[in-house]
């Protein structure tokens, strides 16, 4: 005869390991008792179960409760048992010994392996400043049994870079990715990817990128030139930028207070129905967290009974 | 030939406690099981605990949390020990070895001890 039994028996921690130990033997010969143990280098063998024949199956008071026998039917001269709820100290090597009449007795090893999913968390980096250099931007840590892969998954160009530490019974792996910020990136998603051969698909941690930056400001609204004549209603100073955190707009007239009737409403300057008054020149004040820009713009208003006179635009930053 | 001999019963009160002892001597096998059966009066002999080589325990679920079965190999001792005794624990106690012969196994009995639980 012959046991038929697995090299390696692979769980998920937290599942039922199911530890085969199978006799092939003659029509005649049977199985008295299985006796499973634990083959522990330090420890030595020591039982962890036995299934006997005549008086059923005997428990290892330290597995009480753990191991059972796979539901019927069973054949008997099926030696296999379930050990439940797989934990990462049971990961080892296992010995089934077959004691049969009247063939003797027959011996197999096996392996254990439980598989620790990991539980991957991602840190963002350093606030992002565009103008800075390679940066942090998220590290991402994962530790399982067997050490899992982290790799990062965008459209982001940037480096990434890893390092492990190994436990008694686990590896943790960090990966960072550092990247030029820059503020195209805003907004971009960067995903931590982790693989583990107890995980069924892989398991993403998505972290959204965001750029601190401020772009230089410009001033519209004196293009058409028939809308700055006296009497004229509706005229307008639009100040155009654009920043992460978004930008505050502050509107001011360089040469005095702002006239009467004039409303700043966030980046717009609106006008009442204009005069030569409205003359002069106006500043555009951008700002964020990170900055702060401005553009200045000469007003002049036409008045029609003076043709001779023309809008002067000067824009400087 | 096994020969078993039984020590420890007696008369004791509801809730109490008594030790078993079972030694056996003779051609004991490398593989052999050994426990504790009862027998009360005019019932079937039911199986109380048996005991591995290795330490691993089975137990009667009307004794299990009260009964600990232990053994020493060097000695070829098996033990019971009895805690939180009932007056329907009453019983004769036959310790029982089990070797391999031929084909399956043999039971080998010692005499008994009478245990009685007075309520």
């Known amino acids: 005869g012959e046991l038929e039994t697995s090299d390696v028996v692979t769980v998920v921690l937290g599942q039922d390991a199911k530890l085969p130990c199978f006799y092939r033997g003659d029509p005649d010969e049977q199985v008295g008792q299985v006796a499973w143990a634990r083959v522990d280098p330090n420890e030595g063998i020591r039982e962890l179960a036995l299934l006997h024949s005549k008086y059923g199956l005997h428990v290892n008071p330290a597995y009480e409760d753990r191991v059972e026998q796979p539901p019927p039917p069973r054949d008997p001269l099926d030696g296999s048992v379930l050990l439940r709820n797989a934990v990462q100290a049971d990961e080892g090597e296992y010995e089934c010994r077959v004691s049969t009449f009247p063939a003797g007795s027959f011996q197999a090893r096996m392996r254990l392996r439980v598989l620790v999913p990991p539980l991957p968390s991602l840190n963002p980096g350093p606030p992002l400043e565009e103008g800075q250099g390679l940066t942090l931007a998220a590290s991402c840590t994962a530790e399982g049994s067997p050490a899992p892969s982290v790799t990062w998954d965008t459209e982001v160009k940037g480096t990434q870079s890893s390092r492990s530490f190994t436990h008694p019974r686990s590896a943790a792996v960090t990966s960072e990715f550092h990247l030029v910020p820059s503020r195209s990136m805003n907004g971009q998603p960067l995903t931590c990817v982790v693989s583990h051969p107890g995980l069924l698909q892989d398991r993403r941690i998505t972290h959204t990128l965001q750029v601190a930056f401020l772009a230089e400001a410009s001033v519209r609204g004196l293009e058409d030139q028939n809308l700055w004549q006296v009497g004229r209603e509706g005229a307008t100073l639009k100040c155009l930028s654009e920043g992460q955190p978004p930008p505050k707009y502050n509107w001011t007239r360089l040469d005095g207070p702002l006239p009467s009737g004039v409303r700043v409403k966030g980046d717009t300057l609106g006008f009442p129905p204009l005069t030569t008054e409205h003359s002069g020149v106006y500043v555009c004040h951008v700002s964020n967290e990170l900055s702060s820009r401005d553009s200045q713009v000469t007003v002049e208003v036409l008045d029609p009974e003076d043709p001779g006179k023309q809008v002067d635009l000067v824009s400087a930053s | 030939e096994v020969q078993l001999v039984e020590s420890g019963g007696g008369l004791v009160q509801a809730g109490g406690s008594l030790r078993l002892s079972c030694a056996a001597s003779?051609?004991?096998?490398?593989?052999?099981?050994m426990g504790w059966h009862r027998q009360a009066p005019g019932k079937q002999r039911e199986l109380v605990a048996t005991?591995?080589?290795?330490?691993?325990?089975n137990y009667a679920d009307s004794v299990k949390g009260r009964f600990t079965i232990s053994r020493d190999n060097g000695k070829n001792t098996v033990y019971l020990q009895m805690n939180s005794l009932k007056p329907e624990d009453t019983a004769a106690y036959y310790c029982?070895?089990?070797?391999?012969?031929?084909?399956?196994?043999?039971?080998?009995w010692g005499q008994g001890t009478q245990v009685t639980v007075s309520s």
């Open positions: 003779g051609s004991i096998s490398s593989i052999n099981l």
């Open positions: 029982v070895d089990v070797e391999p012969s031929g084909m399956g196994w043999r039971d080998y």
């Open positions: 005991i591995t080589r290795g330490g691993s325990t």
